[in-house]
């Protein structure tokens, strides 16, 4: 008796973080024996969608012509072969930005910081939110989450960095979100350029949890060493 069918591969183009109204294509790649592909979305009636395979039958395309809240969420796909259904793919999380107005990102005391000193990035939203995310451009795993305890709503989140090194320099943006859907984010804040000056090159901080075994300098997560802010927010690494 043959073992279970290998699980398909699921991905999104141009990516898995999509602005409201933009198009996105979800691809599911199985085997040449596939007769049908099925896409399921977590917490939604199944099947979410079904497609016939594209020649040579090893993948299927699921098109979203205009991204809306309905499409944000966690997906898995399957394929059916003559011997039955495959294992589910690894999940794909499709995130929509533009669900809420953009927050403001600032640096305290200044976006120009001397190496070895401290800086705090402050993300502020006009309306109370319970999740804030800090994103660094060109980082492979750029998300740093602050989520409020017990669903308490906050107008801001602090991301302290200390001691600052040259690795912390770069362009940052932040997003805000409500806990009822982690897949719906605000518009991005305007970018903030953090400039680290100083001739003394500090040793790079050792992350307590590395994100990638083959991580380069831009792939490290932000590792603020200050205490978690007193705003009732809790830090989550993505």
């Amino acid at each position: 008796q043959a073992g279970p069918l290998p699980k398909p591969t699921l991905w999104a183009e141009p990516g898995s973080v999509i602005s409201w109204g933009n198009s996105v294509t979800i691809w599911c790649q199985g085997t040449l024996e596939a007769r049908e592909y099925r896409l399921d979305k977590e917490e939604s009636p199944a099947p979410w969608d079904r497609q016939n395979p594209l020649e040579p039958k090893n993948k299927a395309r699921f098109s979203i012509p205009s991204m809306t809240e309905d499409y944000a969420g966690r997906y898995r796909c399957y394929y059916r072969s003559p011997v039955g259904w495959s294992q589910p793919s690894d999940p794909l999380e499709l995130v929509m930005t533009g669900a809420y107005s953009k927050p403001t990102l600032s640096a305290l005391p200044s976006p120009l910081v001397t190496s070895g000193k401290s800086v705090t990035l402050l993300c502020q939203s006009r309306s109370p939110m319970d999740t804030f995310l800090l994103i660094k451009e060109r980082a492979a795993h750029p998300l740093l989450h602050l989520r409020s305890e017990h669903g308490a709503q906050q107008h801001q989140a602090e991301f302290p960095m200390s001691p600052v090194t040259s690795v912390h320099g770069g362009t940052y943006r932040c997003f805000s979100s409500h806990g009822f859907s982690h897949y719906l984010l605000s518009h991005p804040s305007d970018p903030l350029e953090l400039i680290v000056s100083g001739s003394l090159e500090d040793p790079r901080p050792s992350p307590t949890r590395s994100v990638s075994t083959a991580a380069g300098p831009e792939d490290q997560p932000l590792m603020p060493t200050g205490s978690v802010p007193h705003s009732g927010l809790r830090r989550h690494w993505e």
């Epitope: 979305k41 917490e43 939604s44 009636p45 199944a46 099947p47 979410w48 309905d70």
Partner: nanobody, 121 residues
């Protein structure tokens, strides 16, 4: 060949209840989300409720707390239980089947002929 057959419509007083049934062919029922739309005269068709093969449901905002949907795999049938009916629930109710994304796009793959529900005293 008729693949979705509705029954259970009729005239009911405000505050009353009705149960709509939809029988489907096994091939359609076993692989699709089943659901109900309604269309009142001069109004747009709206999704009332849907239920997946995983038994997860979606209930339209206008009927939440009053209508429930269920499916019976042994009978290849889906049911819409309508309680606390109001005059504004008067419409032709259509059974539909397809992938859920088609329900969101108001274009399921299969449709029934419809059954009239009239709520009036």
């Amino acid at each position: 060949e008729v693949q979705l057959v509705e029954s259970g419509g009729g005239l009911v007083q405000p505050g009353g209840s009705l149960r709509l049934s939809c029988a489907a062919s096994e091939s359609i029922f076993s692989s699709n989300v089943m659901g109900w739309y309604r269309q009142a005269p001069g109004k747009q068709r709206e999704l009332v409720a849907a239920v997946g093969i995983n038994r997860l449901t979606k209930i339209g905002d206008s009927v939440k707390g009053r209508f429930t949907i269920s499916r019976d795999n042994a009978k290849n049938s889906v049911y819409l239980q309508m309680n606390s009916l109001r005059a504004e629930d008067t419409a032709v109710y259509y059974c539909a089947a397809g992938a859920y994304v088609r329900f969101l796009q108001q274009s399921p793959d299969y449709w029934g002929q419809g059954t009239q529900v009239t709520v009036s005293s």
